[in-house]
Interface confidence: low
């Protein structure tokens, strides 16, 4: 009977990439039939309750704050609802990852992030963000500043002792513009990330419009020069006439 309903949403009010000891606010969509909403973390296929709200659907969407983020609190989250005779409903899942140095130090080193062909591109072009590290990395994550959606995750490739992942953004749209960072993670805890790479700003410039502006400016300059030239000729011709007489 769960299939009769659309799946409720769950979202992180800020980025789902949280610094060590930071906090995040998680919002569960209010469900009309629910009288109790619980936030669950899924660890090793078992559910553990993180918090619960006795708010009802006609009140605001239930929110849960997770403070002092650490590796234990990182993972997959889901909202569980108590409803009428259907007993349970579940939201989609939300992945929360924590970024910071692992106690063992294996994630101490930041990866590097570069872009090909250029950090300034036009819409429709193909762009690749390359995340690299000289240290053992199982997966790389790419996050965009200010984005609430989950970061992109790619398995790393070993290239001559370098671990790397290529994130392809193609075709690029203006929505792709922004500041990116990448992170390393190990399969032992995929929700624990390294410190971020240096930020990389991707500028998506609409060259068609820019070129039209440039052409307009050039035309204006040429027109102005033409007017000035005509004016100069006219003035020069008048001076000659005066000299003849």
């Amino acid at each position: 009977q769960e299939g009769d309903f659309p799946m409720p949403f769950i979202s992180a009010k800020s980025s789902p990439v949280i610094p060590l000891d930071g906090s995040v606010k998680i919002q569960c969509q209010a469900i009309r039939e629910a009288y109790l909403t619980q936030l669950m973390i899924i660890k090793n296929s078992t559910y553990r309750e993180i918090g619960r709200r006795l708010k009802f659907w006609n009140e605001t969407d239930p929110e849960f704050v997770i403070d002092h983020m650490d590796a234990n609190k990182a993972g997959r989250y889901q909202c569980q609802y108590r409803i009428g005779h259907y007993r349970f409903r579940y939201s989609d899942t939300l992945e929360l990852v924590v970024t910071g140095e692992e106690p063992a130090g294996r994630l101490r080193d930041r990866p590097s992030l570069s872009v090909r062909p250029s950090p300034s591109v036009a819409p429709g072009e193909n762009v690749t963000l390359l995340c690299q590290s000289g240290n053992r990395t199982d997966t790389f994550l790419l996050s965009k500043e200010g984005a609430a959606h989950r970061p992109l995750r790619l398995r790393s490739q070993d290239q001559d002792g370098w671990y790397q992942a290529e994130f392809s953004l193609s075709p690029v749209t203006s929505a792709h513009g922004g500041t990116y960072r990448c992170y390393r993670s190990l399969s032992t805890n995929p929700y624990l990330l390294s410190q971020p790479s240096e930020p990389l700003a991707l500028l998506v410039a609409d060259y068609t419009m820019q070129n039209l502006i440039r052409m307009g400016l050039a035309a204006s300059v040429l027109l102005l020069l033409g007017i000035l030239l005509c004016q100069a000729r006219h003035d020069h011709g008048g001076a000659r006439e005066a000299a003849r007489s």
Partner: antibody, heavy 118, light 113 residues
Framework: QVQLQQSGPELVRPGVSVKISCKGS????????MHWVKQSHAKSLEWIGV????????NYNQKFKGKATMTVDKSSSTAYMELARLTSEDSAIYYC???????????WGQGTTLTVSS | DIVMSQSPSSLAVSAGEKVTMSCKSS????????????LAWYQQKPGQSPKLLIY???TRESGVPDRFTGSGSGTDFTLTISSVQAEDLAVYYC?????????FGGGTKLEIK
């Protein structure tokens, strides 16, 4: 320690209404929903309904809709249940019970005995 | 509604004996996501309120003697008292909370010979 203190026994005439109370103490009252249960000789234990002590929203057993009305007063940490148009069938012991996170009743009130008799 | 059926309705045993009572539900009480059976056992001694013994079918409430054991999954559940004591004289109820329309079994009355 957690306690649910219910109001005393009631002897009432058929056709009238009665309101019984359940005061919670020893815990944060609004953190737990409150259930009401009827115990009669004929039907053993019957679930009446549940109320959110946080917002006052309710869910009733269809059988008790129109018969029972659950309310809550957060300021006094008290849950109430009013029973309307009483008949001899309503004579029973009524319990309030606090529900824990795992959907089981971990604390019960001592019960309120209702006798409906002319 | 989920119907809960308990058997036997009553039984009489001597102190020290082992006793088992059954509770069957008309549909499964196992939630596949949480891997929990939403079934609880309550003990009601004469003149007292019901008291929680077992929840999630097999988890003993703190303070409950370890002679009480809950078992079963899905639709068939059992409460076992390994060595009955005189103070165990009571009616035992099972209750499902899988469906919000909570329902109780009819109870099993335990008498001590």
């Amino acid at each position: 320690q957690v306690q649910l203190q219910q109001s005393g026994p009631e002897l009432v005439r058929p056709g009238v209404s009665v309101k019984i109370s359940c005061k919670g103490s020893g815990y944060t009252f609004t953190d737990y929903v409150m259930h009401w249960v009827k115990q009669s000789h004929a039907k053993s234990l019957e679930w009446i309904g549940v109320i959110s002590t946080y917002s006052g929203n309710t869910n009733y057993n269809q059988k008790f809709k129109g018969k029972a009305t659950m309310t809550v007063d957060k300021s006094s940490s008290t849950a109430y249940m009013e029973l309307a148009r009483l008949t001899s069938e309503d004579s029973a012991i009524y319990y309030c019970a606090r529900e824990s996170d795992g959907y089981y009743f971990d604390y019960w009130g001592q019960g309120t005995t209702l006798t409906v008799s002319s | 509604d989920i119907v809960m059926s308990q058997s036997p309705s009553s039984l009489a045993v001597s102190a020290g004996e082992k006793v088992t009572m059954s509770c069957k539900s008309s549909q499964s009480l196992l939630n596949s996501r949480t891997r929990k059976n939403y079934l609880a056992w309550y003990q009601q001694k004469p003149g007292q309120s019901p008291k929680l013994l077992i929840y999630w079918a097999s988890t003993r409430e703190s303070g409950v003697p370890d002679r009480f054991t809950g078992s079963g999954s899905g639709t068939d559940f059992t409460l076992t008292i390994s060595s009955v004591q005189a103070e165990d004289l009571a009616v035992y109820y099972c209750k499902q909370s899988y469906n919000l329309m909570y329902t109780f079994g009819g109870g099993t009355k335990l008498e001590i010979k």
